[in-house]
Interface confidence: low
């Protein structure tokens, strides 16, 4: 089952919103065209892993340290940038970065949101991807994220790895895969609905900046939380709708939804479980996408500590990192009990899966991610997943 | 304080429709998802169907499908479920969830008892 | 669809005492990508809704008390109340959170002795 979680925050609202599972992509296009509209497709679309949350949660989760462009590695445009590792050793970027399946486009963006299409079903793994014996194939997945997501995929891009669900599993053909970086988490209408009140979110915006943050929720795209159930359905995984770095959204909730802890992983660390249950990465060589956070957005403090980031230039912050002389910490980093801090070294798992947080000059934070040959991980925390697994039912 | 509240509940005949809603208090609607629950008396519990927080992605158990519609109104906070050619079996209490990032139900409403007898 | 299944049906413990309650699912709910077991536990009084105790099989919901702690991991897991309350009376559902259909067990009575 292609365990993609989606990207950016609002990556996951929008994935796969509505396409049957069983048809085939109406267009097997990979480029980032821009977030899909969302459409209100009945459709059983759910990743593994997705969860219910909806995408302000999946902003807040993700600290969704969203803004402007981010930059993949295996995009042109990133040259040889210079980063700092999260230890603070410079390290070169490479030129470029191969994309583990050269699926995706160029992700600086953000990229003129393109009219909602019907979506295909869900997508395959790529020419030249291996796939796994149908018998080390979960028949079901995870659900996280499967609620929040958006609406139907424009063609372009295609349901974000969603996947017919129950059945036998079958390898899809290699060629329907459609690797979608990030989603704006626009409601039916083509609108930010559901990015309204995330601090800094562009509400009703037509242009947003990639975001996406926890089950937000989706939940289900809130990919990136936990949830994916269907019928001839689909999950698709999702990343953690609450991050633990802005809580202030959830300040009208019980304290039962308040994300504790200062760590980017916490009880809500819906983090895109994706393939078989227990199922680990396929073993094959890793290799990495780059993935840099834009620090533009406020984050919301983080609890037991007052930690932001400043918000883009000419956007309001909730929780402007000055220091004490008036000035902001730079980004990539936060204000952190009176000091500005790497967010790599104080958020250890700040990049999600086992990527590699990097600070880049002028771009902040940056997130190297794993990639084998089964499973590798995108979105700007390294918070989707995606597989060569697919289910059928 | 969250706060889930169901009405609509009812006795109705089979094959007839019943529509029920659910007002959300207390917490940010629109971010989560939010799913609809039953018990038939004496029972257990069955997941029904679910909606994403924008309402652009819906979910149903097999035994709903096609009859039952979820759906949900950002800007009343309200979640609903359409229920139409009603059957016996779908007699129960309805609960209306609030869906957390992991697909557990942290918040549930009191429910709302829908019969469907002759 | 995964089948949860629970035992024992019906328990009866003394005050003071341990209850523990099983549920095993027809497959892993346990995902590798983030090592979390989807699983929750809730706890239903009579003639109330029911009350989310433990997500992720062994994370306690905010407010509940420690007496109550889940475990296991994959398709076997465990609800242990440590020092059964009058108040915990009541019936407990294990719920699968991976997959869609979400599944419930068939639930445990948990009684006074």
């Known amino acids: 089952v292609p365990a993609r979680e989606a990207g950016s925050a609002v990556e996951a609202e929008e994935l796969v919103k509505g396409s049957p599972a069983w048809e085939p992509p109406a267009n097997d296009t990979r480029e980032e065209a821009g977030p899909p509209a969302a459409g209100e497709d009945e459709a059983s679309w759910t990743a593994p892993g997705g969860e219910l949350a909806g995408p302000e949660e999946v902003l807040q989760e993700s600290a969704a340290v969203t803004g402007t462009a981010w930059l993949e590695a295996d995009s042109p445009g990133l040259g040889g940038v210079t980063a700092e590792a999260g230890s603070g050793d410079a390290q070169a970027l490479p030129a470029t970065l191969q994309a583990p399946h050269e699926v995706l486009g160029q992700s600086i963006m953000p990229p003129a949101i393109p009219e909602a299409t019907e979506a295909s079903g869900p997508p395959s793994p790529t020419p030249g991807d291996k796939l796994s014996p149908a018998s080390e194939l979960p028949k079901e997945s995870p659900l996280e994220v499967w609620l929040n997501l958006g609406g139907s995929t424009p063609d372009p891009q295609g349901p974000e790895l969603t996947y017919p669900f129950q059945g036998t599993l079958e390898p899809q053909p290699a060629s329907d895969i459609i690797d979608i970086d990030y989603f704006e988490g626009l409601d039916g209408e083509g609108r930010g609905a559901d990015l309204g009140s995330f601090p800094g979110s562009p509400g009703t915006s037509e242009n947003h900046p990639d975001t996406e943050g926890e089950t937000p929720s989706w939940s289900l795209l809130d990919l990136y939380d936990d949830f994916t159930p269907f019928d001839e359905s689909d999950f698709y995984p999702t990343t953690s709708f609450y991050d633990d770095l802005d809580e202030e959204e959830e300040e009208e909730e019980d304290d039962k939804d308040a994300v504790g802890g200062g760590d980017l992983e916490d009880e809500n660390e819906l983090l895109v479980p994706t393939g078989k249950p227990g199922l680990g990465p396929g073993t094959g060589q890793p290799t990495s996408r780059w993935h840099a956070v834009p620090p533009q957005h406020t984050l919301g403090s983080v609890p037991g500590s007052s930690i932001a980031l400043r918000p883009r230039p000419g956007e309001p912050g909730r929780d402007l990192a000055s220091s004490e002389n008036g000035t902001e910490c730079r980004s990539g980093f936060v204000r952190h009990n009176g000091s500005c801090r790497s967010v790599c070294d104080l958020f250890p798992s700040y990049c999600h899966n086992g990527g590699q947080c990097y600070l880049v000059e002028n771009i902040g934070a940056f997130c190297r991610c794993n990639t084998q040959d089964y499973i590798w991980h995108k979105g700007m925390r390294c918070e989707s997943i995606i597989t060569d697994f697919q289910v059928m039912c | 304080e969250v706060q889930l509240l169901e009405s609509g509940g009812g006795l109705v005949q089979p094959g007839g429709s019943l529509r029920l809603s659910c007002a959300a208090s207390?917490?940010?609607?629109?971010?989560?998802?939010m799913s609809w629950v039953r018990q038939a008396p004496g029972k257990g519990l069955e997941w029904v169907s679910a909606?994403?927080?924008?309402?652009?992605?819906?979910y149903y158990a097999d035994s709903v499908k096609g009859r039952f519609t979820i759906s949900r109104d950002n800007s009343k906070n309200t979640l609903y479920l359409q229920m139409n050619s009603l059957r016996a079996e779908d007699t129960a209490v309805y609960y209306c969830?609030?869906?957390?990032?992991?697909?557990?139900?942290?918040?549930w409403g009191q429910g709302t008892l829908v019969t469907v007898s002759s | 669809d995964i089948v949860m299944t629970q035992s024992p049906d019906s328990l009866a413990v003394s005050l003071g005492e341990r209850a523990t309650i099983n549920c095993k699912s027809s497959?892993?709910?346990?995902?590798?990508?983030?090592?979390?077991?989807?699983l929750a536990w809730y706890q239903q009084k009579p003639g109330q809704p029911p009350k989310l105790l433990i997500y992720?099989?062994?994370t306690r919901e905010s407010g509940v008390p420690d007496r109550f702690s889940g475990s296991g991991s994959g398709t076997d897991f465990t609800l242990t109340i440590s020092s059964l309350q009058a108040e915990d009376v009541a019936v407990y559902y294990c719920?699968?959170?991976?997959?869609?259909?979400?599944?419930f067990g068939q639930g445990t009575k948990v009684e006074i002795k």
């Open positions: 969830a609030k869906t957390k990032p992991n697909n557990a139900f942290d918040y």
């Open positions: 207390g917490f940010t609607f629109s971010s989560y998802a």
């Open positions: 909606i994403s927080g924008s309402g652009g992605s819906t």
């Open positions: 497959q892993s709910v346990l995902y590798s990508s983030n090592n979390k077991n989807y």
């Open positions: 992720w099989a062994s």
């Open positions: 719920q699968q959170t991976a997959t869609q259909p979400l599944t």
